[in-house]
């Protein structure tokens, strides 16, 4: 008789999840000398321990503390790039601008990027069939709690000028319900962070509007200002040219507005 299994609304754990996490850890620690001391088996054990045998709607930040401890990493606090709904361009940017870091350029972010995982209460099995959806099932699921935890820590570590890349093609350029809007914004430390600089990325080729005047950007400015943090905003009209100019700043076409 097959054992009854909870059916959740979201996709199940990414196939070969344990192998993927372990392989990513090994690769990352090989590439980043400052993380060579990390024992990837211990990292996987701590990761697994955060959600295995636990109800996938009752996960807490405390469950991830052993993993957070093992993945402790120092990134230059003044070189942090946050992003919202525009992950690919943010990652392309930090691949070129090597001295800047998104969360996914850190070990923990790199391990979990684009993966899904969950377990089941009282069994050591990983659920490959379905996992809780944030909206339809519950917010305290393994994936959401992980990203909330690492995002909070990442924002708390930031200092000086913090940059955020925002998608100007979205109806809500700044979305209060995104991870950036609900977690990172509220965990920037005014004692350390002087300015939040938003880069609003335009989608259309002929889009010359000043999206920094968008009502949601004004709302972001007001929230940030109330934290005694300065706010600035730049339109990136041509993201393709923007990346090209990051690669080749000497290019003659890079002196004009991007």
């Amino acid at each position: 008789v097959p054992r009854w299994r909870q059916q959740w609304s979201g996709p199940g754990t990414t196939k070969r999840f344990p192998e993927t996490v372990l392989a990513r850890c090994v690769k990352y620690t090989e590439i980043h000398p400052e993380m060579r001391h990390v024992d990837c088996q211990s990292v996987w054990d701590a990761f697994k321990g955060a959600f295995i045998s636990k109800h996938p709607c009752n996960i807490t930040e405390e469950d991830y503390q052993p993993l957070m401890k093992l993945g402790t990493q120092t990134v230059p606090c003044n070189k942090i790039l946050l992003w919202s709904r525009i992950k690919d361009l943010a990652h392309q940017f930090t691949q070129v601008q090597r001295d800047m870091f998104t969360l996914e350029d850190t070990l923990l972010g790199y391990l979990a990027d684009d993966l899904t995982w969950c377990g089941e209460f009282n069994t050591s099995k990983i659920n490959y069939q379905s996992c809780p959806d944030w909206r339809k099932d519950c917010s305290n699921n393994p994936v959401s709690v992980f990203w909330k935890t690492v995002s909070r820590r990442f924002a708390e570590a930031a200092c000086d000028v913090v940059h955020v890349m925002l998608n100007g093609s979205r109806s809500k350029i700044f979305d209060k319900n995104s991870t950036f809007g609900s977690v990172e914004v509220h965990n920037l430390q005014p004692e350390k962070v002087q300015t939040l600089e938003a880069w609003v990325i335009h989608g259309g080729r002929e889009d010359s509007r000043d999206l920094c005047q968008d009502p949601t950007i004004k709302e972001l400015e007001s929230i940030i200002s109330k934290r005694n943090i300065q706010f600035s905003c730049k339109n990136i009209y041509r993201p393709d040219k923007f990346l090209q100019c990051v690669k080749n700043p000497e290019d003659s076409s890079c002196t004009s507005e991007i």
């Epitope: 509220h186 400015e221 929230i223 200002s225 109330k226």
Partner: antibody, heavy 114, light 108 residues
């Protein structure tokens, strides 16, 4: 944090109050203006942020202007077209930790009467 | 924007007073509480919904998240007789008032 003297004003007059701050920089902390009519509750007027951007309560937008002078450590509230309903004690307040109003001036009484 | 209840409460010395504050939308725990005595400016008691301001008695306790917040005064003393206000510290724009209407606390 200290507000300049208020006093007696006539309807349609323009109110100008100056807040002088010491012990902290206007580049590090925003400043809020709040008022309180006699026997009534606290009412937010507006605020000048560390970057110099100003924000106002919806009711105050059309006739209030907040400016700052970082060199002189002063913040000024200007309110036009006064009516008797603007009679209140006006407070200048530091926008402190987590956006709370942590340091209050003693307040200054403004009376609008013909 | 901020609905505060009750408008007035009377409590004997040693009792417990509970004041509630509701925001029209989530303010992400950016809520502070103030005590105001007659003829004085308000005094900050609690910020970030639950953090006690410097020098404030631990008899004052703040709690809540999202849109619902509570100030609890336990072991009420005569010196607690005052008007208490909540304030949302989330944003200073597009608001009518950032303060609640106030609660008068009478100590019997």
């Amino acid at each position: 944090v200290k507000e300049s003297e208020g006093g007696l004003f006539k309807p349609t007059d323009t109110l100008t109050l100056t807040c002088t701050v010491s012990g902290f920089s206007l580049s590090s902390y925003g400043v809020i203006w709040v008022r309180q009519a006699p026997g009534k509750g606290l009412e937010y007027i507006g605020f000048v942020a560390v970057g110099g951007t100003t924000y106002y309560a919806n009711w105050a937008k059309s006739r209030s202007t907040i400016t700052r002078n970082t060199n002189e450590n002063t913040v000024t509230l200007k309110m036009t077209s006064l009516t008797a309903a603007d009679t209140a004690t006006y407070f200048c307040v530091r926008n402190g930790v987590s956006g709370s109003s942590d340091i209050w001036g003693p307040g200054t009484l403004v009376t609008v009467s013909s | 924007d901020m609905t505060q209840t009750p408008a007035s409460v009377s409590e004997p010395v040693g009792g417990t007073v509970t004041i509630k504050c509701q925001a029209s939308q989530s303010i992400y725990s950016y809520l502070s509480w103030y005590q105001q005595k007659l003829g004085q400016p308000p005094k900050l008691l609690i910020y970030s919904a639950s953090t006690l301001a410097s020098g404030v008695s631990s008899r004052f306790k703040g709690s809540g998240s999202g849109t619902e917040y509570t100030l609890t005064i336990s072991g009420v003393e005569c010196a607690d007789a005052a008007t208490y206000y909540c304030q949302q510290d989330y944003s200073g724009s597009n608001v009518d008032n950032t303060f609640g209407g106030g609660t008068e606390v009478v100590v019997k």
